[in-house]
């Protein structure tokens, strides 16, 4: 059942390379490399590079653990991002400026354009650029649930830091819900963690994309660096294959 | 590099069985099966069976995912449990009865007896038996930090349920800290999740082992079923091997 | 000129020898190996006369077991009924019919192989692949296999018909 | 997935998890493990074909990568994917011990 | 662990992760992947001895189980343990796409 023989390292490398050739095409569900005849000259658009870098950064931060991989996860996922609705939009007027929370709203039509069917979504992350933070802060993320209620999602303990840093929250379930519902605009709330005893519940952390009236240090708004949803989904044209291939086995 | 030939299923099974013989002894760091000359007659003690069942239940609830397994995790872990200090102990008097929290204290000498060195601990779980619950409740777990401060550890959303159910919190890091420090008694607090706006912060859930003056339905105290720490650790006599065996490879 | 070959004796190994050129080098490869595209290495030639297993299809769950024949060349396999060729469950998929690769492997089309031993006017003669001889027991179970040019036919006993998917004679269900 | 649900109910010849119950007394001749009396260890078995990819790929062959060589190995091998631990009770002298052994039960396999 | 830190700096003959950088253009003849230009795919290679356990066990043999056959396989095999994904950018027509391919980079191996 096991054979030991002198191993031709070059042959093994060649076989690994050849297997990768098939693997990549297979993961992309391509029968052959795509034609490049329409590719415009010049570098990749800025937005595409930013998206690629976001994805690459996420990978670097991921623990390298093997997960049992359902068939759907074997295939490549298209990565898109949807920026938060800008803060001058009227939706924000309904939510009173408070010292303990900031609000982030998203246009579901943009989400649906990126991911037409909820079942296609494999991961959604809310990404926030936190600016420097002087004290430790415990924050909580909520999802807008019904008219004026919020549903707790997760929390994070933020250590003090002199440099800006991306925060990432897994919101796959929530975005899948939004894609299933009819709403036009949906949102999150980031709040200070309020303990039952304590009365100091101010949100100390500054998130890029908000002109915070709370304190003197206004956060610079870089369009691309305001909060966004990073989406990983099976492209629609690849989706018809997704039913289990067990009958093929 | 790969050979396909008719497979003798019986031989494979025999080889697997033989490999398991070595694997179990190897995981227990035994050179041969232990002598059974001192084993007392009769069934296993109740406490041992309860501990075995606790461990087995934990396994059933665990997701069957392979984790990259450091050398230390390959070897068997001894399982012990340390019960919470009973509620009539004077330590509880220092913490005023409140509607939003319950307190659980543990004797660190008992912990040290079970796990003499912090490095030997591979997992610690706080196990609580929650009695039936009429409404959904969001609870938070805190660790007693300094004189009168508490450090947030984790949270859980408890669904309504008609039957009692064990809750389990991973508190490995905290117990490892306790084993490193000199304190005699250490504790946790289970609290209702308090939102910054909401004022209804009552802990609705009943935990076995507390005579709750808050409501009329007194929880029955079963000694073995009061909160406890389930500890998994490398036995001290097995620990000297724990330095990396890389030089042996 | 730098003599790369003496500078790095491992160049071209393990399946060839290094030959220095003005400003470069090439690999002279051992028998059964051919230079890589840049001529800086040697790779195994899957010679058309190598004999391996011929696999019937890739639909079967156990295509490693769906062996049509065990001792056939890549041409005999892929230019006739095979979907893949190889051994030890290590498979070279046969090129898709009508692709450039198919024409290169099977210049005379489905059912024919080139016979390099017979040369007419300097051109290798093509010969019909005798599927019955190569795959008879696998492709015409319970029937009589008759070679045709190109292809084959399978004749079944009275009350049986030939199932082209199962490649066997099947009882007519009356 | 090549798990017990699928493999135990099929006649899969390729890589799959295979049933194997180990009775400590009968199979290993051991009387020293007091609980459990045995366990479903299972094991992985079956070929994982290596497909030499050609430059001209086609869907039929590519579809096989997912099951037969998802990790694009040079020599794919049928190995455990999901594993579970096994708690045991045994005596050291007069003292009963409960110990947990990691990764003892094979729940599913994969070509890797 | 049989990871890049250990394996790349040692001359380990047994199961270990081996260095392999794939340049899409040079190694695969592909010009269609715009980012990255290549990646450290790596691979697993090396024997995982099967040790027939004898009833009379002894520490030397048992010590080998951890590395060479921790899963007590009937035919242990050197396979990836920790894997990482690879994001790529390529064009479909005039439209650039960012896609993530799971389990593409081998970070460590194990005998399984």
């Amino acid at each position: 059942l096991s054979t030991c023989k002198t191993i031709d390292m070059e042959l093994v490398k060649r076989k690994r390379i050849e297997a990768i050739r098939g693997q990549i095409l297979s993961k992309l569900r391509l029968a052959s490399p795509p034609s490049q005849g329409e590719v415009p000259p010049g570098p990749l658009p800025e937005a595409v590079l930013a998206l690629y870098n976001s994805t690459r950064d996420r990978v670097a931060g991921e623990s390298a653990e093997p997960e049992p991989e359902p068939e759907a996860d074997y295939y490549a996922k298209e990565v898109t991002r949807v920026l938060m609705v800008e803060t001058h939009n009227e939706i924000y007027d309904k939510f009173k400026q408070s010292t303990h929370s900031i609000y982030m709203f998203f246009n579901t039509s943009e989400l649906r354009e990126a991911v037409p069917e909820p079942v296609l979504l494999s991961r959604a992350e809310l990404r926030l650029l936190r600016l420097k933070l002087k004290v430790e802060q415990h924050v909580e993320l909520y999802q807008k649930y019904s008219n004026n209620s919020w549903r707790y999602l997760s929390n994070r303990l933020l250590a003090p830091s002199d440099s800006p840093e991306w925060l990432s929250f897994d919101v796959t379930g929530v975005v899948r819900q939004w894609l299933s519902r009819g709403g036009e605009i949906e949102g999150f709330r980031l709040s200070a963690h309020c303990s039952c005893d304590s009365r100091d519940n101010t949100l100390q952390v500054d998130i890029n994309g908000f002109t915070t009236g709370r304190r003197g240090d206004l956060a610079t708004i870089h369009g691309m660096n305001r909060p966004f949803l990073l989406l990983m989904a099976t492209p629609l044209e690849r989706a018809q294959h997704l039913q289990s291939s067990r009958h093929r086995r | 590099l790969s050979t396909c030939k008719t497979i003798d299923m019986e031989l494979v099974k025999r080889k697997r069985i033989e490999a398991i013989r070595g694997q179990i002894l190897s995981k227990l760091r035994l050179a041969s099966p232990p002598s059974q000359g001192e084993v007392p007659p009769g069934p296993l003690p109740e406490a041992v069976l309860a501990l075995y069942n606790s461990t087995r239940d934990r396994v059933a609830g665990e997701s069957a995912e392979p984790e990259p397994e450091p050398e230390a995790d390959y070897y068997a872990k001894e399982v012990t449990r340390v019960l919470m200090v009973e509620t009539h102990n004077e330590i509880y008097d220092k913490f005023k009865q409140s509607t939003h929290s319950i307190y659980m204290f543990f004797n660190t000498s008992e912990l040290r007896e079970a796990v003499p060195e912090p490095v030997l601990l591979s997992r610690a779980e706080l196990r609580l038996l929650r009695l039936k619950l009429k409404v959904e409740q969001h609870v938070e777990l805190y660790q007693k930090y300094s004189n009168n401060s508490w450090r947030y550890l984790s949270n859980r959303l408890l669904a309504p349920s008609d039957s009692p159910e064990w809750l389990s919190f991973d508190v490995t890091g905290v117990v490892r800290q306790w084993l490193s420090r000199g304190g005699e008694i250490e504790g946790f607090r289970l609290s209702a999740h308090c939102s910054c706006d909401s004022r209804d912060n009552t802990l609705q859930v009943d935990i076995n082992g507390f005579t709750t003056g808050r409501r009329g339905d007194l929880a029955t105290i079963h000694g073995m079923n009061r909160p406890f720490l389930l500890l998994m650790a490398t036995p001290l006599e097995r620990a000297q091997h724990l330095q990396s065996s890389r030089h042996r490879r | 000129d730098i003599d790369e070959c003496s500078q790095d004796p491992s160049l071209c190994l393990p399946h060839g020898a290094c030959k220095n050129l003005q400003g470069s080098y090439v690999c002279v490869c051992d028998e059964g190996f051919t230079p890589t595209q840049d001529q800086h290495g040697c790779e195994e030639v899957e010679q058309p006369h190598h004999k391996k297993e011929c696999y019937l299809n890739f639909d079967d769950t156990v295509f490693c077991d769906s062996v049509l024949a065990t001792n056939v060349t890549q041409q005999e396999c892929c230019c006739s009924l095979g979907a893949g060729w190889g051994d030890h469950c290590e498979i070279y998929p046969c090129p898709v019919y009508s692709s450039a690769e198919f024409h290169s492997l099977c210049p005379d089309g489905k059912g024919y192989t080139q016979d390099n031993n017979i040369v007419n006017y300097g051109i290798p003669a093509h010969r019909d692949i005798d599927e019955c001889m190569l795959f008879g027991s696998e492709i015409c179970k319970e029937g009589k296999c008759v070679n045709t040019q190109p292809g084959y036919e399978c004749y079944c006993k009275q009350g049986f018909y030939y199932d082209g998917n199962l490649l066997e004679c099947v009882d007519v269900d009356e | 997935a090549l798990d017990t649900n699928y493999c135990f109910s099929s006649t899969e010849k390729n890589c799959c998890v295979r049933q194997l119950y180990i009775d400590f007394r009968k199979d290993l001749g051991w009387k020293w493990i007091h609980e459990p009396k045995g366990y479903h260890a299972n094991f992985c078995l079956g070929p994982c074909p290596y497909i030499w990819s050609l430059d001209t790929q086609y869907s039929k062959v590519l579809a096989l990568y997912n099951q037969h060589n998802p990790g694009a190995s040079a020599a794919p091998c049928c190995v455990p994917q999901a594993l579970e631990p096994l708690p045991i009770v045994y005596y050291v002298g007069r003292k009963p011990k409960v110990e947990q052994l990691s990764n003892m039960i094979v729940r599913s396999c994969k070509c890797s | 662990a049989l990871d890049t830190n250990y394996c790349f700096s040692s001359t380990e003959k047994n199961c270990c992760v081996r260095q392999l950088y794939i340049d899409f253009r040079k190694d695969l003849g592909w010009k269609w992947i715009h980012e990255p230009k290549g990646y450290h795919a790596n691979f697993c290679l090396g024997p995982c001895p099967y040790i027939w356990s004898l009833d009379t066990q002894y520490s030397k043999v048992l010590a080998l189980y951890n590395q060479h056959n921790p899963g007590a396989s009937a035919a242990p095999c050197c396979v990836p343990q920790a894997l990482e994904p690879l994001p790529i950018v390529y064009y479909v027509g005039r439209k650039p796409k960012v896609e993530q391919l799971s389990n593409m980079i081998v970070r460590s191996c194990k005998c399984s």
Partner: antibody, heavy 119, light 107 residues
């Protein structure tokens, strides 16, 4: 193997028109963008025009914009350059080349065809 | 338009010499630069793509480096067949432009 053969060059008077062709073989023509590059006698290389694989996108150098059009017939594996209102400074050897994706490197070239604009 | 300035415009060297040709862009073009070799009466031939990558079949004595605005083509040991004119080309933006060329002659 890849082959590109230009034709249609010759002597033409200023203000007149000329149509160059480039016949391609040995590769899937429609999968590749194509370019025309010219070289005036004794001078350097100058990019003239490019066209995407389907013909949907075209690009031109400022010096020829409005006078030259580039087109392709994928069924005939042929690339064209229609040159109108020719000037003396258009005199050059005209090369067609294949475009490799990404960095737009020109990996295969034809042997060139000479266009002389002279009265 | 992006201008590419090559220097020197010509040079004389002997077989075995190390030769370096530079190309400077009027603005940053990242690594979007290619190098071509052209012999009299022949079509140009791609040597280096993306600033530093050797095209398949090109001898390893040719190498490219640089990024942004300054780029270099190096021939580590000049061979008789290397006497030719060398051009850099930017593909960062349309119009695609070439440098003026560097003629390498026999000393």
């Amino acid at each position: 193997q890849v082959q590109l053969v230009e034709s249609g060059g010759g002597v033409v008077q200023p203000g007149r028109s000329l149509r160059l062709s480039c016949a391609a073989s040995g590769f899937t023509f429609s999968d590749y963008a194509m370019v025309w590059v010219r070289q005036a006698p004794g001078k350097g290389l100058e990019w003239v025009s490019a066209i995407s694989g389907s013909g949907a996108a075209t690009y031109f150098a400022d010096s020829v914009k409005g006078r030259f059009t580039i087109s392709r017939d994928n069924s005939k594996n042929t690339l064209y350059l229609q040159m109108n209102s020719l000037r003396a400074e258009d005199t050059a050897v005209y090369y067609c080349a294949t475009v490799s994706s990404g960095h737009w490197d020109f990996d295969y070239w034809g042997q060139g065809t000479l266009v002389t604009v002279s009265s | 338009d992006i201008q590419l300035t090559q220097s020197p415009s010509s040079l004389s060297a002997s077989v075995g010499d190390r030769v370096t040709i530079t190309c400077r862009a009027s603005q940053s073009i990242s690594s979007y630069l290619n190098w071509y070799q052209q012999k009299p009466g022949k079509a140009p031939k791609l040597l280096i793509y993306a600033a530093s990558n050797l095209q398949s079949g090109v001898p390893s004595r040719f190498s490219g480096s640089g990024s942004g605005t300054d780029f270099t083509l190096t021939i580590s040991s000049l061979q008789p067949e290397d006497f030719a004119t060398y051009y850099c080309q930017q593909t960062y933006t349309v119009p695609l432009t070439f440098g003026g060329g560097t003629k390498v002659e026999i000393k």
